[in-house]
Each structure stands twice: as structure tokens, then as C-alpha cells.
Interface confidence: medium
């Protein structure tokens, strides 16, 4: 055999007697006719030797140690080679050792290619005899991270300050690659991080550093579990001991991405969480131990990953193939933070990719399922854009704003369904016609239905909210000048039962200049409350809105304003209101920035109320609330 080690390779090869056996005949290393029982070869040396027996593997072992110094120069990161190549080495049980020294601030990551690693406990051995022993260091103290076999879940181990990796290969094993690479990372600020990846159902047993001896005092160790979100993970502690703490408390912490209650803190004696969907981290935190009687902290635990138990595997089909410019998002509804552990709540696409949020887009059929203990923790928000790019093509076209039945059939509450209605600027306007007349939500007469329509401008620079409208009122139609968003917002689960009451048609109509026109046909004996858009913030500068109020022939309408003055103070221009009788065209004009608002007035015929704003000074906005009440005429004035 010839072993030649390149100069400055920092490799040392040691051939020595292994565990003594009861073999009668001794065996020696033969070098230059000398018989020796130990041979050390250093960098830059070339040695030719042989053995005095036919089966040296029964007598000798070989250790190949490579020292990697990351303190004084650049680190050779990347795939780690077996040097010298196993084909050049005598067929002895061999141990390759890589000793990497680095600064405390440098993180080192061992990345294991498939097959990943499986940790074994004391007294256990690996079926194929290939073992990986990994240790780290805290200052001058060596810390055993663990011993691992092949065919497991451990894919990466991150440490800092240094790492010692020993790969033991039996003499008969054909392996000629290390199976791992080294990468540098930023400081991990803990003893180590072990990543464990599950491709499907399975389990992994893992142990604290130095197990079964004590975990280093006041240290932190983290395990990161990568679990397909359509599966559930449960943690159980197989064996643990607590040390005697002087300060702080020994504990485990769970970090679940997407959870609102991170980190979840548990005592080691607590029942550990189960039925967790998707990825999670588990950390073991030590304490300051009593110097006289420290005791030991140690932990051996199992993670079991399996398909969800006692849960419906129902698949819901969401057919958006005939929709366009639409997206549907299922997401967690906002909740008040609680410190209590909450199992994951996930929505899955094709039962494969699961996450706490899922967005479905138009043009396809989607199959979804849920992994969630309580579906009321989720809600749906949908956005759909209806755009007309050419006025000649869509003038007078109509579009029904209906929530598709596929969406209503999902077991998750619909929160918002928003239609963005876009028209060519200065070419077309929009009219909204409800299936059932609408009531405007006001403090005086709030909506008490399970849903409302929120109507607002969809022009980015324009802050204009027309209001919230629900079925069961007197507003027959709403005309708006340009792009708007109409959002159907639900307020109660009973929306499912009331869904038939929804129904709004939008039509593209010839362009008009007013920001909005409300057509109101009041019902007898009901008081209709109406208010200017952007209530609480004030009608935008130089904006004009109108109400077209119908009065049946046998009725009289009482128009009442709810304050004496408008309160608006104009910086430039004038704010005014015109009340015009539609039959006679007779009109009254009121200067809103000067005059008092009119006293209650009676109208025997249909009339217009038009309000136009000036550019108000800040804080002196234009907000008006008025009501219309019909009563039967006592005298026929026609």
C-alpha cells in the first residue's frame, strides 16, 4: 500500500491496533522490513507499507483526520471529499474525522444528502455499520451532539465555534463519498440547530446534546421540523430529567410559523402538543444550575408524523374555470392573541400543499380540503375585476354581481367579495341596480342584515366612500361617475341562508360628470335616512352628488336635515345645495358655507337634492344627514 498526503493538506492518517481480539496469530504493519503496530502519516509524507497477515481488518483500524482551520483564512466550504480516496486505503475499518475550528461568531452547517440521518441512543448500532458521530464545542469543552445512522430524517445540523464530524465505515463498505457538505452561516446564537425533514408519514427519535449525560448548563438547542402540511405531527417525551436550577427555568418552546401565539412555552413534564399541521420548531432551554447539586438535564423525545386522525377528508371543488380576473383567498380571521397553544389550521390544495393562507385564481378548477379543528378560524376574501377597455364595446352591457355558488358551498365563512369595476376615463359611467332596494347604513337606522354592500371609489388618488348599503330600503339605483369597488361584506353566518337576497347588476352607461346619483323611491310610512358620501371624513373637495327622490301621486314627502348648519368652511369656491322640483323645475339654492340648512319641507312631487362641495379648510368638512318620510296626502293638490 502507498499513502501519499499532499503538503499542507492538514491530513493525518493513523493506522493502529483495533479492539484486541483473541486471535492467536499477531499481525504487524511492515515498513522497510520493520514490524510495527502503529503508523502515523502526516501532511507531505509518502509511505509504502504492507501487513504481515492476510486479514489486517481483524487487527487494525485506520483514522484519517483532516483539520480545517477557519480562524486564520478562508474556509473550504462545499461538498466534503473522502481524502485519500477509499480505493487507495487498505481495507480496514476506517474513520474519517473532520475537525473544523471557527470563530464564535461563525455558524457552520453540515448538510446531509439523501439518505438523511437517524439519531441512535446509547447501546444502539447501525444496521450497515456506517455511523456519523457529531460533536461541537463550547469554549474548550467538547459537546456530543449525537450519533447517527443512515436512512432517517436529519438533513442539516448547524453549529458555531467548531464542529467535529467522524464518519465510521466498516472495512467491507463500498462507500466512497462523505455524503455531506459544509456551509457557512451567520451565528446561530445557540449550541446547535438540527433540521429534520419528513417526506411522508414516519417518526424520529431525537436526543439532547450529550445524552444520556447532562445537557450543558444554560444552553439552548433547537430542532426544526419540516413536515408536509397535509400531515400532522405529535411530540412525545420518552425520557427526561430535570437539573436543579438556581436561576431561570428549564423549558421547551415551540415555534409554529403562522401561529399568533409564538413561542408556545411548555414545561418538560407538561403534555406536549399534538396534531400540529406543517412545519414547527422545538427548542430546549437549560438553566443556571445549583453549583453544589447540579443534577442533569436530558431529553429523549419522539416526533410522530401521520395523516390527520378523526378529521373529514372531504374535498371541495372550487370551479373558477369560467371566471376571470378573480382571486379567492382563504386565510385566518384576525383573533385576539392568546398564550394558549392552538393547533394549526390549514387549507390544502389538491390535499398536498397546505398553508394557513391559500389564494386561488381564476381560469382553473381547484380541489381544496381543510386541516383545521375549527373552520370558524378561517374566512374567505374574494376579488374580481370587471373592466371595460373600450366604451364602444360595452356601453349598455350589464353584469350580474353575484357570489358564485361554488364559493357559497365552501365550509368557510365569506368575509368580503369585492368587485372592482373599471371603465374608460371620461367615456363611461356605471349604474348599480339591486335586486332588492337598498338601505343606507346610518347611526340612526343601522343595517341589521347579514350582509352589506360597501361602495367606494377605485381610483387610487380619490378617497371617496359612498357608503354601506343593505337590502330592505328605498334606494333603487346608484349611479357613479367612474371606477368603483363594490364589496359584499358578510356580518353573520346566516348569510348562507340570506344569500338569495344578494343580487346587484352593474351596467356601463354613458359618462356623466357628477360623482354619484342615488335614485330613491321611499316606501309609505318608513323614514329613509340618507347621508353624504365619506361620512366622518367629509365630502371630497369640489365633489357633487345628487339624490333623485320619487314621490308617489297620493303621497307627500317631508325632507328633514339633522342639523342647523352644514359646518363646512370653504377655503376656495362655494358649497351649495339645490333642491329642485322635477315637475315644475322650481329650485331653491342654499349656500352651505353661509346659510342655515332649510327647515323641514314638504314636497308633493318628485324632487332632486344636489349637494356640491367647495375646497374646505381642514377640520371643517361637509357632512350632511337628512331623511325623507312619506305620508298620505290629505288634500289632492293636482
Amino acid at each position: 500500500f502507498e499513502i501519499a498526503l499532499p503538503r499542507e493538506s492538514n491530513i493525518t492518517v493513523l493506522i493502529k491496533l483495533g479492539t484486541p481480539t483473541l486471535l492467536a496469530k499477531p499481525c504487524y504493519i511492515v515498513i522497510s522490513k520493520r514490524h510495527i503496530t502503529m503508523l502515523s502519516i502526516k501532511s507531505g509524507e509518502r509511505i509504502v507499507f504492507t501487513f504481515s497477515c492476510q486479514s489486517p481488518e481483524n487487527h487494525f483500524v485506520i483514522e484519517i483526520q483532516k483539520n480545517i482551520d477557519c480562524m486564520s483564512g478562508p474556509c473550504p466550504f462545499g461538498e466534503v471529499q473522502l481524502q485519500p480516496s477509499t480505493s487507495l486505503l487498505p481495507t480496514l475499518n476506517r474513520t474519517f474525522i473532520w475537525d473544523v475550528k471557527a470563530h464564535k461568531s461563525i455558524g457552520l452547517e453540515l448538510q446531509f444528502s439523501i439518505p438523511r440521518l437517524r439519531q441512535i441512543g446509547p447501546g444502539e448500532s447501525c444496521p450497515d455499520g456506517v455511523t456519523h458521530s457529531i460533536s461541537g464545542r463550547i469554549d474548550a469543552t467538547v459537546v456530543r451532539i449525537g450519533t447517527f445512522c443512515s436512512n432517517g430524517t436529519v438533513s442539516r445540523i448547524k453549529m458555531q465555534e467548531g464542529v467535529k464530524m467522524a464518519l465510521h465505515l466498516p472495512w467491507f463498505h463500498p462507500r466512497n463519498v462523505s455524503g455531506f457538505s459544509i456551509a457557512n452561516r451567520s451565528s446561530i446564537k445557540r449550541l446547535c440547530i438540527i433540521e429534520s425533514v419528513f417526506e411522508g408519514e414516519g417518526s424520529a427519535t431525537l436526543m439532547s446534546a450529550n445524552y444520556p449525560e447532562g445537557f450543558p448548563e444554560d444552553e439552548l438547542m433547537t430542532w426544526q421540523f419540516v413536515v408536509p402540511a397535509h400531515l400532522r405531527a405529535s411530540v412525545s417525551f420518552l425520557n427526561f430529567n430535570l437539573s436543579n436550577c438556581e436561576r431561570k427555568e428549564e423549558r421547551v418552546e415551540y415555534y409554529i410559523p403562522g401561529s399568533t401565539t409564538n413561542p408556545e412555552v411548555f414545561k418538560l413534564e407538561d403534555k406536549q402538543p399534538g396534531n400540529m399541521a406543517g412545519n414547527f420548531n422545538l427548542s430546549l432551554q437549560g438553566c443556571d444550575q445549583d453549583a453544589q447539586s447540579p443534577g442533569i438535564l436530558r431529553l429523549q423525545f419522539q416526533v410522530l408524523v401521520q395523516h390527520p386522525q378523526n378529521e373529514s377528508n372531504k374535498i371541495y371543488v372550487v370551479d373558477l374555470s369560467n371566471e376571470r380576473a378573480m382571486s379567492l383567498t382563504i386565510e385566518p380571521r384576525p383573533v385576539k392573541q392568546s398564550r394558549k397553544f392552538v393547533p394549526g389550521c390549514f387549507v390544502c390544495l389538491e390535499s398536498r400543499t397546505c398553508s394557513s393562507n391559500l389564494t386561488l385564481t381564476s381560469g382553473s378548477k381547484h380541489k381544496i380540503s381543510f386541516l383545521c379543528d375549527d373552520l370558524t378560524r378561517l374566512w374567505m376574501n374574494v376579488e374580481k375585476t370587471i373592466s371595460c377597455t373600450d366604451h364602444r364595446y360595452c356601453q349598455r352591457k350589464s353584469y350580474s354581481l353575484q357570489v358564485p355558488s361554488d364559493i357559497l358551498h365552501l365550509p368557510v365563512e365569506l368575509h368580503d367579495f369585492s368587485w372592482k369595476l373599471l371603465v374608460p376615463k371620461d367615456r363611461l359611467s356605471l349604474v348599480l341596480v339591486p335586486a332588492q332596494k337598498l338601505q343606507q347604513h346610518t347611526h340612526e337606522k343601522p343595517c341589521n342584515t347579514s350582509f352589506s354592500y360597501l361602495v367606494a371609489s377605485a381610483i387610487p388618488s380619490q378617497d371617496l366612500y359612498f357608503g354601506s348599503f343593505c337590502p330592505g330600503g328605498s334606494i333603487k339605483q346608484i349611479q357613479v361617475k367612474q371606477n368603483i369597488s363594490v364589496t359584499l361584506r358578510t356580518f353573520a353566518p346566516s348569510f348562507q341562508q340570506e344569500a338569495s337576497r344578494q343580487g346587484l347588476t352593474v351596467s356601463f352607461i354613458p359618462y356623466f360628470k357628477e360623482e354619484g346619483v342615488f335614485t330613491v323611491t321611499p316606501d309609505t310610512k318608513s323614514k329613509v335616512y340618507l347621508r353624504t358620501p365619506n361620512w366622518d371624513r367629509g365630502l371630497p373637495s369640489l365633489t357633487s352628488v345628487s339624490w333623485n327622490i320619487s314621490v308617489p301621486r297620493d303621497q307627500v314627502a317631508c325632507l328633514t336635515f339633522f342639523k342647523e348648519r352644514s359646518g363646512v368652511v370653504c377655503q376656495t369656491g362655494r358649497a351649495f345645495m339645490i333642491i329642485q322640483e322635477q315637475r315644475t323645475r322650481a329650485e331653491e339654492i342654499f349656500s352651505l358655507d353661509e346659510d342655515v340648512l332649510p327647515k323641514p319641507s314638504f314636497h308633493h312631487h318628485s324632487f332632486w337634492v344636489n349637494i356640491s362641495n367647495c375646497s374646505p379648510t381642514s377640520g371643517k368638512q361637509l357632512d350632511l344627514l337628512f331623511s325623507v318620510t312619506l305620508t298620505p296626502r290629505t288634500v289632492d293638490l293636482t
Epitope: G363, C388, Y393
Partner: antibody, heavy 119, light 107 residues
Framework: QVQLVQSGSELKKPGASVKVSCKAS????????MHWVRQAPGQGLEWMGW????????TYADDFKGRFVLSLDTSVSTAYLQISSLKAEDTAVYYC????????????WGQGTLVTVSS | EIVLTQSPATLSLSPGERATLSCRAS??????LHWYQQKPGQAPRLLIK???QSISGIPARFSGSGPGSDFTLTISSVEPEDFAVYYC?????????FGQGTKLEIK
């Protein structure tokens, strides 16, 4: 099933007129717009214009204003393309196609009518 | 007017290969773009609507990408019956224009 059946090939002299028909069946004509597309021999597709089947109002691309007229007879579910003062460069296959949506895609096409203009 | 430029003009492939056809619009047209296939002596056939939406009856090997101004029609594994001319069409605004076409031919 939905079908658009066009009239047969035409051979015309320069200066003459031609009227190509497109009969719709399997759906209600007035529910969808009707578009016309021209394809000269060995060339690509050119959109000529469309007719609003609800109102009968035609719209033409700039290159097809003047000699080209789109019309409709809803009683027989048929759309028409008439070309007057024919020129040699009008020789092409003319297709009618059904338009879907406000910004249309053409989901059904007629088989095409070859109009040849030659002296 | 939206100008659509298709590339390449001709694409020579063998059955089983992947075809990638490009269509570039002179300005952003969102997803207002459709793809058609035309075989000699036949009318065009709608393959993809609104840049990426599939059409019932069209094999799943046809897919499209968008929105914006750069669009792609992909045939994952070309079948013998796919050799034809492919056109993209803008439906953004009048006039509704077509690209000049890409001829997919057998290598």
C-alpha cells in the same frame, strides 16, 4: 351544437360587389357579438370589425371603413359582410367568428368563404 | 393600436419536444390576449384565453403565461397533430389585432 355556416366561394371581377353570409345555429344569435376576420392567401389574420347583434350597430377597423358593410338579419340568425368596388387585393378567405365577453375571444368560427377578385 | 410581434417566425421541432412560442405586445395589455391554432385549409381554433386560461376540449399539453406585455404559449410535448400556425390576438382595445403567426413545423 354551436355552428357558424358561411356561404360558398365567390369569383368576382374588379369593381363588382359580393355579399358573404354567416348563419348561426345552436345558440341565440343576439347573445354574442359577431366578428369578421380576413386572411389573404399565405398571410396572417386581420380583424375587420364586429356587429353588435343586440342593436345591429357595426364597428369597423380603420382599414375596413368605406367599402365594407356588416349587417344582420336576426329573423334568420344570419350575419352578412358586403364588399363593394372589389379590388384584386380583396382576394382572401373571410371568416365570421363568435365573440365572447366584453374583450372578446373567438370561440367558434365559420369555415371561411374564399372571395377571388380577378379580371 | 396594439402591435403584436410573434417569435420565432418558424419553429422546427420533432414530436415529443417542448415548444415555446412568444408573443410580445407593444404595450402592457394585462391578460387580454388569446391564442389560436390554424391548420392549412381550416379556420383558426381557440387554444388559450386570457393569457393562461385553458379551453375545454384542448389538450392539457397547451399552456399559456402572462399577463403584461410578454406572453408565451407552451406545448409541453409536441404531438404530430400540433404542427400548424399559431396566432396570438389582443382583445385589449380596438382594433383587435393578431400577431403575424408562428409556424410550427416538423424537423
Amino acid at each position: 351544437q354551436v355552428q357558424l355556416v358561411q356561404s360558398g366561394s365567390e369569383l368576382k371581377k374588379p369593381g363588382a360587389s359580393v355579399k358573404v353570409s354567416c348563419k348561426a345555429s345552436g345558440y341565440t344569435l343576439t347573445d354574442f357579438s359577431m366578428h369578421w376576420v380576413r386572411q389573404a392567401p399565405g398571410q396572417g389574420l386581420e380583424w375587420m370589425g364586429w356587429i353588435n347583434t343586440e342593436t345591429g350597430a357595426p364597428t369597423y377597423a380603420d382599414d375596413f371603413k368605406g367599402r365594407f358593410v356588416l349587417s344582420l338579419d336576426t329573423s334568420v340568425s344570419t350575419a352578412y359582410l358586403q364588399i363593394s368596388s372589389l379590388k384584386a387585393e380583396d382576394t382572401a378567405v373571410y371568416y365570421c367568428s363568435r365573440g365572447r365577453d366584453y374583450d372578446p375571444h373567438f370561440d367558434y368560427w365559420g369555415q371561411g368563404t374564399l372571395v377571388t377578385v380577378s379580371s | 393600436e396594439i402591435v403584436l410581434t410573434q417569435s420565432p417566425a418558424t419553429l422546427s421541432l420533432s414530436p415529443g419536444e417542448r415548444a415555446t412560442l412568444s408573443c410580445r405586445a407593444s404595450q402592457s395589455i394585462s391578460d387580454f390576449l388569446h391564442w389560436y391554432q390554424q391548420k392549412p385549409g381550416q379556420a383558426p381554433r381557440l387554444l388559450i384565453k386570457y393569457a393562461s386560461q385553458s379551453i375545454s376540449g384542448i389538450p392539457a399539453r397547451f399552456s399559456g403565461s402572462g399577463p403584461g406585455s410578454d406572453f408565451t404559449l407552451t406545448i409541453s410535448s409536441v404531438e404530430p397533430e400540433d404542427f400548424a400556425v399559431y396566432y396570438c390576438q389582443s382583445a385589449h382595445s380596438f382594433p383587435y389585432t393578431f400577431g403575424q403567426g408562428t409556424k410550427l413545423e416538423i424537423k
